[in-house]
């Protein structure tokens, strides 16, 4: 048993038929020492007596919020909290595994630049008595310091019958240097209550690793005279790293007709314009990507040919 | 990268098409390494991460461009202590600093270069011939260095008598090669702010 | 010992809003993991949960029903309230408080109020 | 939302034999179903939650079982008292809902 924060605990238990679970003992936080009852859940019936308690968790009944009173007056709580391990594997029930870029990938996180702010996301399909908590470090051993903020409910989509809803939390690196070059990972730590399940989810990365820039600005296209070919020109997004020189892009210049099936056109370039044909009803994208690193591509900014 | 880019114009700063070269060189090489060690510790989430530069060389801070010189995180360990010639240096961009910065990026290559030959002359030795380092690679590093163009001592390769343990030596490959992507993309970055200013 | 009573009128007219009060006594919804939902049972037909309000505030409604439906609390008056707007005949039914615990079933009801929509 | 179907509608069992509900969500609620008794004229009463944790003060006769989708109420000794309605309700997600009921009587 551990405590989770002030009067929360959670009590890890093997999860099998008949498991003998786990002896806890409840210590009544009050000075007194007589005629002291508990009570479970604010139910009226009388577990037991004295300043201790000791019971044997074993299952979700034995979990839940016991109480300590003193002549109907409340002296103080403790919320019990379990935590399921089956055949050696802590349960993952409360988040979906998004499964991408590998099986059991319960958290993604996201970078717009080297600033050392990052976002990170999961999914579950629990709408109630749902609490999330998130810690992170950088390095374990001897963490150095990230802070994130509260996670928010940031999405909520239909997959056939299903909802399923996304929560997000951003993040930022106590003391970074964008130019610095990373040798400990990220650390990020997720606690997930959902009413007395307590599970946990880690995931670890380096920023270097989960940057995505946000698609090119200002996308402009002009027509070149006698000619069907169009200059596209366009900027570093507003929230890329600066200086540009340094923190540099590449690009990928698309031209789509308006068919899916119709073949598309790539160019890929260094420099912030680029020469192609516009055919009629096409539309021209463009995205970019850490010009020396090769993490992932941007969204595309798009514009119609017309 | 997989990825046509246009060459330099060959009136550019002229360590930038050699930077670009070694960081191609070096993303293949590992590249190499990940699939033909499938089954070693290879990938970024397994291997340690060690940089043999460490108290050796100061490149990031050397190299900071000048808009981060106000970021007191990339302020920390700022070395002064460097040869202040080369040739990479156009006479009108000669600064202290930024000889400082093209030195410490020379005496990365060396260490790297050092211990690169070394691990080949043990991968040689593998009955398994299972990989070899890219000589491509290798030549690269030898490239940047002479245009580069500091006077240093050679530092003789390190020769081992006892016979080598293959699968350690692997995983140091892998865990070298990772780094020294991680110090190219800096190099790169480096030049790339160098050529623009 | 805990106990919950609903109270509200009898008999609405279509188009009008109902209002009902849940009091309770035994616990309290001030600092504890509690809630109060509000369900109700058409005669001779199943149960349908309609709203609940936790102890922090956080409130949920039925879709189906949420435009119409507004739940608060006064915890200083161990009450909550459910006001229904634009009721209709087919809202004819008996409302019923129930307590949520922390084990998130319904463990105390009240006894149920029996509201008829009619004009 | 989630769908609970319970079958049978109507169940009549002899007294001292086994009774058993079921109950099937139209998606995992994994063990966030809760089963209730209900009397002619009486509020609902809370028996089992978490799917298989009998409630303070309920008869072991009563149990509960299932996960994800599946869920079964089962009564071992049909008594007279237990002459009711039975009801199953998730609240995995909202909104919470209740299965149309299983009206169970003696034989």
């Known amino acids: 048993i551990w405590e989770l924060k002030k009067d929360v605990y959670v009590v890890e238990l093997d999860w099998y038929p008949d498991a003998p679970g786990e002896m806890v003992v409840l210590t009544c936080d009050t000075p007194e020492e007589d005629g002291i009852t508990w009570t479970l859940d604010q139910s009226s019936e009388v577990l037991g007596s004295g300043k201790t308690l000791t019971i044997q968790v074993k299952e979700f009944g034995d979990a839940g919020q016991y109480t300590c009173h003193k002549g109907g007056e409340v002296l103080s709580h403790s919320l019990l909290l379990l935590h399921k391990k089956e055949d050696g594997i802590w349960s993952t029930d409360i988040l979906k595994d998004q499964k991408e870029p590998k099986n059991k990938t319960f958290l993604r996180c996201e970078a717009k630049n080297y600033s050392g702010r990052f976002t990170c996301w999961w999914l579950t399909t629990i709408s109630t008595d749902l609490t999330f908590s998130v810690k992170s470090s950088r390095g374990s051993s001897d963490p150095q310091g990230v802070t994130c903020g509260a996670a928010t409910l940031s999405a909520e989509r239909v997959r056939g019958d299903n909802k399923e809803y996304e929560y997000s939390v951003e993040c930022q690196e106590d003391s970074a240097c964008p130019a610095a070059e990373e040798s400990l990972p990220i650390e990020v730590m997720v606690d997930a209550v959902h009413k007395l399940k307590y599970e946990n989810y880690t995931s670890s990365f380096f920023i270097r690793d989960i940057i995505k820039p946000d698609p090119p600005k200002n996308l402009q296209l002009k027509p070149l005279k006698n000619s069907r070919q169009v200059e596209v020109s366009w900027e570093y997004p507003d929230t890329w790293s600066t200086p540009h020189s340094y923190f540099s892009l590449t690009f990928c210049v698309q031209v789509q007709g308006k068919s899916k099936r119709e073949k598309k056109d790539r160019v890929f370039t260094d420099k912030t314009s680029a020469t192609v044909i516009c055919r009629k009803n096409a539309s021209i994208s463009v995205r970019a990507q850490d010009r020396y690193y090769s993490s992932s591509w941007s969204e595309w900014a798009s514009v119609p040919c017309s | 990268r997989n990825l046509p880019v246009a060459t330099p114009d060959p009136g550019m700063f002229p360590c930038l098409h050699h930077s670009q070269n070694l960081l191609r060189a070096v993303s293949n090489m590992l590249q190499k390494a990940r699939q033909t060690l499938e089954f070693y510790p290879c990938t970024s989430e397994e291997i340690d991460h060690e940089d043999i530069t460490k108290d050796k060389t100061s490149t990031v801070e050397a190299c900071l461009p000048l808009e981060l010189t106000k970021n007191e995180s990339c302020l920390n360990s700022r070395e002064t202590s460097f040869i202040t010639n080369g040739s990479c240096l156009a006479s009108r961009k000669t600064s202290f600093m930024m000889a400082l910065c093209l030195s410490s990026i020379y005496e990365d290559l060396k260490m790297y270069q050092v211990e690169f030959k070394t691990m080949n002359a043990k991968l040689l030795m593998d009955p398994k011939r299972q990989i070899f380092l890219d000589q491509n690679m290798l030549a690269v590093i030898d490239e940047l260095m002479q245009a580069l163009n500091f006077n240093s001592e050679t530092v003789p390769q390190k020769s081992s008598l006892e016979e080598p343990d293959f699968y350690k030596t692997k995983i140091k490959l892998c865990i070298l090669l990772h780094a020294f992507r991680i110090r190219a993309v800096t190099i790169d970055r480096v030049m790339s702010y160098l050529n623009a200013s | 010992e805990v106990t919950l009573r609903e109270s509200g009128p009898a008999l609405v007219k279509p188009t009008q809003t109902l209002t009902l009060t849940c009091t309770f006594s035994g616990f309290s919804l001030s600092k504890s993991v509690m809630g109060v939902s509000w369900i109700r049972q058409p005669p001779g037909k199943a149960l349908e949960w309609l709203a609940h309000i936790y102890w922090d505030d956080d409130k949920y409604y039925n879709p189906s029903l949420k435009s119409r439906l507004t739940i608060s609390k006064d915890t200083s008056k161990n009450q909550v309230v459910l006001t229904m707007t634009n009721m209709d005949p087919v809202d004819t039914a008996t409302y019923y408080c129930?307590?949520?615990?922390?084990?998130?079933?319904?463990?105390?009801w009240g006894q149920g109020t029996t509201v008829t929509v009619s004009s | 939302d989630v769908v609970m179907t319970q079958s049978p509608d109507s169940l009549a069992v002899s007294l001292g034999e086994r009774a058993t509900i079921n109950c099937k969500a139209s998606q995992s609620v994994s063990n966030d179903v809760a089963w209730y008794q209900q009397k002619p004229g009486q509020p609902p009463k809370l028996l089992i939650y978490y799917a298989s944790n009998r409630y303070t003060g309920v008869p072991d006769r009563f149990s509960g079982s299932g996960y994800g989708t599946d869920f079964t109420l089962t009564i071992s000794s049909l008594q007279a008292e237990d002459v009711a309605v039975y009801y199953c309700q998730q609240d995995y997600n909202s909104p919470w809902t209740f299965g149309g009921g299983t009206k169970v009587e003696i034989k």
């Open positions: 129930t307590r949520r615990g922390i084990r998130s079933a319904m463990d105390y």
